[in-house]
């Protein structure tokens, strides 16, 4: 899945909110997995959604949810209790320079990965941007190559930080270029662990 | 150590596994250092190995091993008990564009830093890729400069995430371009902390 | 910077998240600081605003975090740099960007780099650009140690609570 066409960036990443983020309360149900006792934690692995979107796996490979954490692609990651959480995210991207010379502005792509909070005690209003990273990639063209895409490029955009969260709040990832996400093993993930 | 020549990337990074990783069980021995009680943790600092390899320091500067963690360059980092660990890695890279114009494809280098798991309950088979970051660098060339290397470039490839580990399993770092690693203080490290 | 800056969400500027009231027994030393957006040519760390906080003994003095008790801490920081199209004038030389977390301790007579990243960007050859640097790791710290940052390229920082931050927590 070598992406050459550059998706128009979302003007308001919060609006695009994980393909229609709804903030209704999840039913009180057993966590999907509970692999270890102790502090709430989760590690989710990027997986393609239909229509070139970014979804998340909760059980495959290294993914897990523990101690009451819950997740749905529609609503994001819900932490079961108030506390101080270390949240982290890494999104791998890949693509190709489009064919032909032309305006470099048209070739340049700024990849953004953002972590938002919504719902719960925070209220049903506008999602709140918590942490984000960005990287501008300007694929180098071979000026002699007028046909065909340029060489494949890769980059990763990652970050992590402490956030005070309340029970019922949701955190979710929003990205600017879902068509360029690299779903290879270990490249794209996000997670949370309660540290206090 | 400004690297201009681009090392061919390993087709199977797991195979190149930390300069010949063996998975035999470590003898039950005291940890190399045990500077503080509590949860197992380690922070290892990149150091040059003979033959342009990447090795790791366990005691110099800010490096440490605590509470039964063990490390060897041949076998990687062994965690002393089952649990949830936050694993992290940052590798600084530096280099120079090779001389002369030419095809940008020939100048491009994709730098990969990967964290693998092997051994223990996971079994003696193929190492498992846990987390990985990548960055394609295409050094900007001075088109008129036919002799000498182009300008110096720097970048860092890092990541961190939660992984459920079992006692006896080993984690180790594999990188695509050991000849380009920046060993300056604070630039290249990997580590693990038990969080649950 | 218009067109390339990462804008704080409306929600975050409109209201602050309610403060946590955690039982003291669960508190561990922790801090999360954000870059002061009102100081464009320096990187000044702020607590007690937006989502920034100091908890259970951490304090901020002379732009440094003071470690309250000895132990293992996870320390992290991020910066995001940006540039306008063709903002350099008569040069095609790259811009040097770097961010470092440093330790000043009674054990060392100088600032020791703990976490360090650097990058050369070519603003003369690139359009509006953004570049983030994040790093974090575990360190054994002693009570009274000072954690600070050094940044090359401060005029190019995107100073918002989500993009420029510095924190630590006891493990």
């Amino acid at each position: 899945q070598d992406q050459g066409g550059l998706v128009t960036e979302t003007a308001d990443p919060g609006a695009q909110a994980q393909q229609g983020l709804g903030f209704q309360k999840l039913p009180e149900e057993e966590p999907e997995t509970d692999l270890s006792p102790g502090l709430p934690a989760a590690h989710l692995i990027g997986a393609p959604l239909k229509g070139q979107g970014l979804g998340w796996e909760t059980t495959k490979e290294q993914a897990f949810l523990t101690s009451g954490t819950q997740f749905s692609d529609a609503e994001g990651l819900a932490l079961p209790q108030d506390g101080l959480y270390y949240l982290y995210c890494l999104v791998g991207y890949r693509g190709r320079a489009p064919p032909g010379g032309g305006d470099p502005q048209g070739r340049s792509v700024t990849l953004r990965s953002s972590l938002y909070r919504a719902g719960g005690a925070y209220g049903p209003g506008t999602p709140e941007l918590l942490l984000e990273g960005a990287e501008t990639v300007t694929p180098v063209l071979d000026p002699a190559r007028r046909q065909g895409y340029g060489p494949l490029w890769y980059t990763s955009v990652g970050f992590g930080g402490l956030v005070q969260l309340r029970r019922g709040e949701r955190v979710y990832v929003n990205i600017s270029h879902p068509d360029m996400v690299d779903f290879a093993r270990g490249k794209t993930f996000f997670g949370a662990v309660m540290v206090g | 150590q400004d690297q201009g020549g681009l090392v061919t990337e390993t087709a199977d990074p797991g195979a190149q596994a930390q300069q010949g990783l063996g998975f035999q069980k470590l003898p039950e021995e005291e940890p190399e250092t045990d500077l503080s009680p509590g949860l197992p943790a380690a922070h290892l600092i990149g150091a040059p190995l003979k033959g342009q390899g990447l090795g790791w320091e366990t005691t110099k500067e800010q490096a440490f091993l605590t509470s039964g963690t063990q490390f060897s360059d041949a076998e990687g980092l062994a965690l002393p008990q089952d649990g949830l660990y936050y694993l992290y890695c940052l590798v600084g890279y530096r280099g120079r564009a090779p001389p002369g114009g030419g095809d940008p494809q020939g100048r491009s280098v994709t730098l990969r830093s990967s964290l693998y798991r092997a051994g223990g309950a996971y079994g003696p088979g193929t190492p498992e890729l846990l987390l990985e970051g990548a960055e394609t660098v295409t050094p900007v060339l001075d088109p008129a400069r036919r002799q000498g290397y182009g300008p110096l470039w720097y970048t860092s490839v890092g990541f961190g995430g939660l992984v459920q580990l079992r006692r006896g399993e080993r984690v180790y770092v594999n990188i695509s371009h050991p000849d380009m690693v920046d060993f300056a203080r604070g630039k290249t490290f990997f580590g693990a902390v038990m969080v649950g | 910077l218009p067109g390339v800056g990462l804008t704080p969400s409306a929600a975050q500027t409109a209201r602050q998240h309610p403060k946590m009231h955690l039982a003291h027994s669960t508190l561990k030393p922790a801090a999360h600081l954000i870059g002061d957006p009102s100081k464009q040519n320096s990187l000044l760390w702020r607590a007690n605003t937006d989502r920034a906080f100091l908890q259970d003994g951490f304090s901020l003095s002379n732009n440094s975090l003071l470690v309250p008790t000895s132990g293992i801490y996870f320390v992290y920081s991020q910066v995001v740099f940006s540039g306008k199209a063709y903002s350099p004038k008569a040069t095609s030389s790259p811009l040097y960007l770097a961010h470092e977390v440093q330790l000043f301790s009674s054990q060392y007579p100088f600032h020791v780099p703990l976490l360090s990243s650097q990058k050369m960007v070519y603003p003369g050859l690139q359009e509006p650009w953004l570049h983030s640097m994040y790093h974090g790791a575990a360190f054994q710290l002693t009570q009274g140690d000072q954690l600070s940052t050094h940044t090359d390229g401060i005029p190019h920082l995107v100073l918002s609570p989500s993009t420029v931050f510095f924190g630590a927590f006891a493990l």
Epitope: G101, P104, L141 | P143, L152 | K89, T91, S92, Q118, L125
Partner: antibody, heavy 114, light 113 residues
């Protein structure tokens, strides 16, 4: 608005070395390259080379390799050029410049005479 | 090295006249990736350091009067002063920053009649 302030005129003997300073004020210069330019009467402007104060990276004009050495001190926001084995050919006005912002120093006159 | 040639080496004009001076490079200064010409023009008044007038071949520096215009692409560039003033007495240099080493033209000396 930034400025580059250079050290004063120097009178040196042949064979000696001299170090000229260039202090950036009004901005932090560590991310931007400081260039050095030589101007002799009737010779126009010659580019000696440049230094990145943050990284310490340098680029020299081949014609000045062995003659000029660049250093920089980030803490004092100052760049330096050292000229060694001075001869009368080195008598000139030396300028420092920051091409990113378009700033130039006022120039330092070096006279080499026995 | 890229050789920069300026012409004329000097010219004398009256106040209010239009002036054009030429700068030619021994190879193209147009960077294909971003379609920018890596050329600057400097003004050096007697006893002063050079002052940046134009960069990217045609972008006027802040504070530079609009009577100064840079034009051209590739290897041929022109600096035009639409209506010369007495304070424009100076030597004008072009410089390429496309390649190392950076090189300057020999200068055009503008004298006022």
């Amino acid at each position: 608005q930034g400025q580059l302030q250079q050290s004063g005129a120097e009178l040196m003997k042949p064979g000696a070395s001299v170090k000229i300073s260039c202090k950036a004020t009004g901005y932090t210069f560590s991310s931007y390259w400081i260039e050095w330019v030589k101007q002799r009467p009737g010779h126009g402007l010659e580019w000696i080379g440049e230094i990145s104060p943050g990284s310490g990276s340098t680029n020299y004009n081949e014609e000045f390799k062995g003659k000029a050495t660049f250093t920089a001190d980030k803490s004092s926001n100052t760049a330096y050029i050292q000229l060694s084995s001075l001869t009368s050919e080195d008598s000139a006005v030396y300028y420092c410049a920051d091409g990113y912002h378009g700033y130039w120093g006022q120039g330092t006159t070096l006279t080499v005479s026995s | 090295d890229i050789v920069m040639s300026q012409s004329p080496s000097s010219l004398a004009v009256s106040v209010g006249e239009k002036v054009t001076m030429s700068c030619k490079s021994s190879q193209s200064l147009l960077y294909s990736t971003n379609q920018k010409n890596f050329l600057a023009w400097y003004q050096q008044k007697p006893g002063q350091s050079p002052k940046l007038l134009i960069y990217w071949a045609s972008t006027r520096d802040s504070g530079v009067p609009d009577r100064f215009t840079g034009s051209g692409s590739g290897t041929d560039f022109t600096l035009t002063i639409s209506s010369v003033k007495a304070e424009d007495l100076a030597v004008y240099y072009c410089q390429q920053y496309y390649s190392y080493p950076r090189t300057f033209g020999g200068g055009t000396k503008l004298e006022i009649k």
